[in-house]
């Protein structure tokens, strides 16, 4: 990584290539998806603390004051009783039990310089302090936990600040070396890993630039860079000291922890933005890494500033290569407060994988110890730190990807931090511990948070072993399986768009002259009524369906167009004819219809205006009008349509009646009655002759606890299913009544004054009416929701369930943030089989939004994985799945980017992908199994070929 330039060694700065390389990478590329794999066998798992943050007992047992004691007194006056903090000094045994709980292989802690040497010089050691560190090290060795010891984590003895001006003074270099020498002599037999200084960037930048850290000086850039310079030289001196005097017999390693943010350019194609990113990284990480891990000098672009001290050639030699590994810190302190981050007009990012790649390119692929990583939670959060789990999961998976895909030599990981404690400028307003500590308590018990449980599991599993209970399988759906595609409301053509043979006149075309048509008088030709083929939109639609090779097509009728007045007084026969044409043209190609009578849309709920203005579904008369409308559709189309859906997603429609929760429940009640009446009408009047089946489709997303270590989240997931699906499914498919869990929960909230909701009661007559009014289970499934228990007291029905969603940042998600969670489909299907009678199940909508207009890779990935899970449900779990309808055929405004075809009917690549799935009826090496029989070959039509 060195290049000759005018006989001068200059470090190459290859890190810039990170942004140059950032061409488009598919979101479903295995290198981008969450990686289920394990870390290398010898990978080290650890946890860290900083002495000042956790030790407490700041004035006890002969410890001298540090610059941070002074800073707390002078700058953080609102901080009360900080003296004891987490009190690790007193409760060493409790810390050790916490380490045992996690099962870590190393513990990174720092020695408090003023606890060992109260006035900073090594003249007189504080025996009690020495005893504490000896006890800690002995206990770790006993437990087979490797100590990684930081010599300086910001708690400089106050005496050194007052006498010398602290790190601004070069005298500190020797004083620090004396202190380090003592530590090597005293503890070196038990310590194999040493860190000289923790994140020197923050020491200099916040200590002397922003004034946000001790000693709280601000605004003097010369001081900032002088401090940085002295820190580098102090580290370098200690490294040489260790290398020469201690390494030969102690055989340890020594480094310095360097911290950084990460930055992405506004526009990757803009070279200036890329250069700004490189400068941003160089001015933070490069400031210290270039001299130590690079060419012994500051990054070139920094040296143009007059405030940057110079290294002599001898000093460069002295400083260069003074680290045995790259110790790296990536956490909130380098990102917050955001106005102090060196952004250079670009965008900060939490992409740990990318920064590791930058380090690899910039510093010749060093061995890396992540010596601080984690995030923070608000102080009011006790043990349920759910977001911390997801941050950890995300960071750790990025590290794993860096190791497995990018061949980066990360050999250990330090979760930060073991215990809640003093968080520097945030004092006690944020928490970063894996263990919760009540600072006001006497005993300072260490209570494992969810993140501690999660990290323990990661350590046990050495990463992320594959979660699937069943690997992807080869297999096929039965021959009579319905492969479909769903459209929402099909807007009818009110008049024929391409009429043919409707004009009785004969014309002569003046081809050679003015090219006009002239009518031949006295001649009348036979005409014919308009035909289905005269509708351009139907022709287009059927072409799309044929291209997909689907066997079924689901679409919804437009109630408003068929019955504009909402009753049978005015029937638009032209519209009914259009729909009949859609069905018959499809049937000619072997494409059977599944027709939805009522598919609510947001604008006016899909109701005829008179019904809408008289209260819509809050008015029981709407159910009667719906019955009349359904009867008309059965009569006009039922000879051709064998699968009917009465209402699409009534469990979502009712949410639109959200003035109060009781409106929502009332609307839902009326929708169920309406559905049941229509089902009975069909059963009584039409089934005997038409032999069809009727259902309603429910929005059926799966739910999982966002935090599996918290029982309330499991209960919230259960509640979600009850309130979302069972709310309709129990009355209609099972008991004729609302789910017991739902009734009890609403009643309990009402009793406690947390809700004014009342579920309507089914009368005995209503209960009998609705129960069993389903011929098959139709479900629309899109994603899995990760849910949290959160008490909500607002007056709307969604508040009654006390459920909130959490976005899992580690999962592949669509632009509209639908998480791609295929196994949720299988779990849902199994749940339905267990809870409702063993009936036929149709997945009537399953799909995702994808911004790509041509190669829609997310959709293809989604289709493959979700159909795979449906297959497992069918073959392994014995679910009677009869059909799968992908969602949706074309784009529309209310559901942007969900279509297989663009709004101008261009096929995306998912069309061909889905048609292949259909051809092989699932997943097989050969095409569709011979037992199914191929459709008959097209027979040649002599007259047709003559005409063409």
């Amino acid at each position: 990584d060195y290049k000759d330039d005018d006989d001068k060694l200059e470090f190459s700065g290859d890190g810039k290539a990170i942004w140059d390389k950032k061409q488009y990478v598919s979101p479903v590329n295995p290198g981008q998806l969450f990686l289920y794999d394990t870390f290398p066998k010898n990978f080290s798992w650890g946890v860290g603390t900083g002495a000042f943050q956790v030790e407490g007992s700041w004035k006890a047992d002969g410890r001298g004051p540090s610059i941070w004691d002074r800073y707390v007194d002078s700058h953080l006056r609102g901080v009360n009783s900080t003296d004891r903090s987490t009190d690790s000094y007193v409760f060493l045994e409790k810390d050790l039990l916490a380490l045992d709980f996690l099962g870590v292989s190393f513990y990174q802690f720092s020695i408090s310089w003023p606890r060992l040497f109260p006035n900073g010089t090594v003249a007189a050691v504080n025996a009690k302090g020495l005893q504490y560190y000896r006890a800690l090290l002995d206990s770790l060795v006993l437990r087979n936990i490797e100590p990684i010891v930081t010599l300086y984590h910001w708690d400089l003895p106050l005496t050194l600040q007052e006498e010398y001006g602290g790190w601004k003074n070069a005298t500190m270099i020797d004083l620090f070396n004396d202190y380090a020498t003592y530590c090597f002599q005293t503890f070196g037999d038990r310590v194999k890993y040493w860190i000289t200084i923790h994140n020197p960037y923050l020491v200099a930048w916040h200590g002397f630039g922003t004034g946000m850290h001790a000693p709280g000086e601000k605004g003097n850039l010369t001081a900032v860079y002088t401090v940085g310079h002295n820190l580098i030289k102090a580290h370098s001196k200690v490294w040489h000291n260790y290398d020469k005097n201690f390494r030969p017999h102690q055989k340890g390693w020594l480094s310095i922890t360097l911290g950084s943010h990460w930055i992405e350019p506004n526009r990757t194609e803009n070279m200036e933005d890329v250069i700004n990113c490189q400068h941003s990284m160089s001015s933070v990480l490069g400031w210290f890494a270039n001299p130590i891990h690079g060419d012994g000098d500051y990054p070139e672009f920094m040296k143009t500033s007059s405030v940057i001290p110079e290294f002599s050639e001898a000093e460069k030699e002295e400083v260069r290569g003074t680290a045995d590994f790259f110790a790296f810190s990536f956490g909130p302190n380098n990102f917050r407060p955001s106005n102090t981050v060196v952004k250079m007009g670009q965008n900060v990012s939490l992409n740990l994988r990318q920064v590791l790649n930058w380090i690899k390119l910039e510093y010749d692929n060093p061995r890396i110890l992540i010596s601080e990583n984690g995030w923070f939670t608000d102080s009011y959060i006790k043990t349920e730190d759910t977001t911390a789990i997801y941050m950890m999961k995300n960071f750790l998976n990025q590290v794993l990807q860096a190791i497995k895909f990018d061949e980066i030599q990360v050999f250990g990981y330090t979760a930060w931090t073991l215990l809640d404690g003093f968080e520097w400028q945030d004092a006690y307003t944020t928490r970063r511990g894996l263990f919760y500590v009540d600072f006001n308590s006497e005993q300072k018990e260490r209570k494992p948070k969810s993140s501690a449980h999660y990290y323990k599991q990661i350590i046990q599993d050495n990463g992320f072993p594959l979660q699937e209970s069943t690997p992807d399988m080869k297999g096929q759906f039965p021959c009579d399986f319905s492969w479909g595609v769903t459209e929402s409301v099909l807007k009818p053509e009110f008049t024929v768009s391409s009429p043919q043979f409707t004009d009785p006149h004969l014309y002569v075309w003046n081809v050679t002259g003015n090219r006009l048509l002239y009518r031949v008088e006295g001649v009348r030709l036979k005409t014919r009524p308009s035909q289905c083929t005269d509708y351009v939109s139907i022709k287009k639609r059927v072409e799309m369906l044929a291209k997909m090779k689907v066997t079924h097509y689901q679409f919804a009728l437009d109630w408003t167009s068929i019955l504009p007045t909402g009753n049978l007084s005015k029937i638009n026969r032209q519209v009914l004819r259009y729909y009949r044409c859609v069905v018959s043209e499809g049937l000619k190609l072997g494409i059977s219809p599944m027709v939805t009578l009522y598919h609510p849309t947001h604008s006016h709920l899909g109701l005829p205006m008179p019904l809408l203005s008289s209260g819509g579904w809050l008015n029981t008369n709407t159910a009667k009008a719906f019955q009349d409308y359904a009867g008309l559709c059965f009569k006009e189309l039922g000879d051709l349509v064998k699968l009917w859906i009465t209402i699409n997603e009534p469990n979502r429609l009712s949410d639109m009646y959200n003035r109060t929760s009781n409106d929502t429940y009332r609307a839902a009640h009326n929708l169920m009655i309406a559905h049941a009446q229509v089902w009975h009408l069909y059963d009584r009047q039409y089934r005997p002759v038409q032999h069809g089946a009727v259902s309603l489709s429910l929005h059926s997303d799966w739910a999982e606890p966002a935090n599996p270590y918290v029982e309330s989240h499991w209960k919230a997931a259960e509640r979600f299913l009850q309130f979302e699906i069972a709310w309709f499914a129990d009355p209609l498919f099972k008991t004729g009544d609302y789910p017991l869990a739902m009734k009890e929960y609403i009643a309990s909230k009402k009793q406690r004054g947390l809700s004014s909701s009342v579920l309507p009661r089914f009368t005995l007559k209503e209960s009998r009416l609705v129960k069993g009014t389903i011929d098959f289970y139709a479900l629309n499934h899109f994603t899995t929701r990760f849910v949290i228990h959160k008490q909500l007291n607002t007056n709307c029905s969604v508040a009654d369930r006390d459920v909130q969603f959490l976005q899992d940042i580690t999962r592949l998600s669509s632009p509209s943030r639908l998480a791609v969670t295929p196994w949720g489909m299988r779990k849902l299907l199994g749940w339905i089989r267990r809870n409702y009678r063993d009936m036929d199940i149709y997945v009537t909508a399953n799909g995702i939004d994808d911004l790509a207009l041509e190669d829609d890779q997310i959709r293809k990935y989604y289709l493959e994985k979700y159909v795979q899970e449906a297959l497992k449900a069918y073959l392994i779990d014995k679910v009677k799945i009869k059909g799968y309808y992908a969602f949706k055929l074309t784009e529309e405004k209310s559901k942007p980017r969900f279509g297989f075809f663009t709004s101008d009917f261009k096929a995306k690549s998912s069309v061909q992908f889905y048609s292949k799935l259909i051809s092989s009826s699932g997943f097989s090496s050969e095409n569709r199994s011979p037992a199914c029989g191929q459709p008959p070959e097209d027979t040649e039509c002599a007259i047709c070929s003559f005409l063409t």
Epitope: E468, S469, F733, K734, W823
Partner: antibody, heavy 120, light 111 residues
Framework: QVQLKQSGPGLVQPSQSLSVACTVS????????VHWVRQSPGKGLEWLGV???????DYNAAFISRLTISKDNSKSQVFFKMNSLQTTDTAIYYC??????????????WGQGTSVTVSS | DIVLTQSPTSLAVSLGQRATISCRAS??????????MTWYQQKPGQPPKLLIY???NLQSGIPARFSGSGSRTDFTLTIDPVEADDVATYYC?????????FGGGTKVEIK
């Protein structure tokens, strides 16, 4: 309180069938599934099958050909029938309530057990 | 079928001491974040009694001296401290895959 009461014969002839009824109280069969488990000195605890709240059944593949579980929700009764018993089927047969939560697959209440001896 | 192997088959513990029972599965009983492992206690002449579900969750009414832990294929039931009333046979059971299977049992006695 939740109870599962079993009734059935104590002695069954080889090659004959065993029928056990399990009457439940204080919970509804439309909400909870019911499992059947047997315990013998030789084979320990063996899960035989389950009838879920919706009425679908899952059987241990080793018994699928000779086992039928059914129920009558209105009477709060679950019926267990096993055909072609052999002496190795001698055991205590338990009906037991499923935990009833989507995310917990466990048995939380057990019947008192029906001790069945297969002997001529 | 998934085989569950319990160890030891019997265990004698002094009152007030800790008892640890191990259950090893022939394949993982964890799926998508859920650990399908349950522990039961059975006293002579009685049906089994649910102690722990989902590997680590204490059934209501069960004393806090019972705890469960583990993941994937290795699980542990701990009783700490052991009381005289804890003399019984303890069974682990998996429900990740049909058929549900039980371990062979561990008999706990007082030393």
């Amino acid at each position: 309180q939740v109870q599962l009461k079993q009734s059935g014969p104590g002695l069954v002839q080889p090659s004959q069938s065993l029928s056990v009824a399990c009457t439940v109280s204080d919970f509804s069969l439309t909400t909870y599934g019911v499992h059947w488990v047997r315990q013998s000195p030789g084979k320990g605890l063996e899960w035989l099958g389950v009838i879920w709240s919706g009425g679908s059944t899952d059987y241990n593949a080793a018994f699928i050909s000779r086992l039928t579980i059914s129920k009558d929700n209105s009477k709060s009764q679950v019926f267990f029938k096993m055909n072609s018993l052999q002496t190795t089927d001698t055991a205590i047969y338990y009906c037991a309530r499923d935990y009833g939560s989507t995310y917990v697959d466990a048995i939380d209440y057990w019947g008192q057990g029906t001790s069945v001896t297969v002997s001529s | 079928d998934i085989v569950l192997t319990q160890s030891p088959t019997s265990l004698a513990v002094s009152l007030g001491q800790r008892a640890t029972i191990s259950c090893r599965a022939s394949e993982s009983v964890e799926s998508y974040g859920n650990r399908y492992m349950t522990w039961y206690q059975q006293k002579p002449g009685q049906p089994p009694k649910l102690l722990i579900y989902r590997a680590a969750n204490l059934q209501s009414g069960i004393p806090a001296r019972f705890s469960g832990s583990g993941s994937r294929t290795d699980f542990t039931l701990t009783i700490d401290p052991v009381e005289a009333d804890d003399v019984a046979t303890y069974y682990c059971q998996q429900s990740n895959e049909d058929p549900w299977t039980f371990g062979g049992g561990t008999k706990v006695e007082i030393k």
